[in-house]
Amino acid sequence: QPDAINAPVTCCYNFTNRKISVQRLASYRRITSSKCPKEAVIFKTIVAKEICADPKQKWVQDSMDHLDKQTQTPKT
């Protein structure tokens, strides 16, 4: 049984300084651990590359909104 207390924590220490096209993005996850120095978003691209981004930036927020909409279940 894995020990959750010792589970590794992923942190972002630097953010991308380039805006990523939403067409290249597949998903995102938040980094909110108090063990990390920065609040962050990790985008996963369609080629499975992970990129750290600053959640304070508008393009990051807009990209999260775009990805959220793709999770909607169509209404019948």
């Epitope: 938040r30 909110t32 959640p55 304070k56 807009d62 909104d65 999770t71 279940t73």
Partner: nanobody
């Protein structure tokens, strides 16, 4: 860590209006999708409405469409729910929630929750 505090609940007669507010602190408010959920006595918590980070997209459960309006002020770290033409069936504890995770309107998509505010609609 995001903290959420709701206010504005109360007792209102059927056909009346209430405006709920939710004040957020901690984290970057404009980076969270915000939602309102409600839980009536003896029932499961259910989605009411949500608003995207930009405020440009909203969604509502069918039973409140045309009566409820969600809005947000990213400068003031607040999200509001204007409730008009209230019905006894709207009686519930209303919860403000913040979503950092990818998703839409499922409870599991929301990471942070307020303590709730009671709305009672009498006939």
């Amino acid at each position: 860590e995001v903290q959420l505090v709701e206010s504005g609940g109360g007792l209102v007669q059927a056909g009346g209006s209430l405006r709920l507010s939710c004040a957020a602190s901690g984290g970057t408010f404009s980076s969270y999708r915000m939602g309102w959920f409600r839980q009536a006595p003896g029932k499961e918590r259910e989605f009411v409405t949500l608003i995207s980070r930009s405020g440009g997209t909203t969604d509502y459960t069918d039973s409140v469409k045309g009566r409820f309006t969600i809005s947000r002020d990213n400068a003031k770290n607040t999200v509001s729910l204007q409730m008009n033409n209230l019905k006894p069936a709207d009686t519930a504890v209303y919860y403000c929630a913040a979503a950092g995770s990818m998703g839409w309107n499922h409870l599991r998509d929301y990471d942070y929750w307020g303590q709730g505010t009671q709305v009672t609609v009498s006939s």
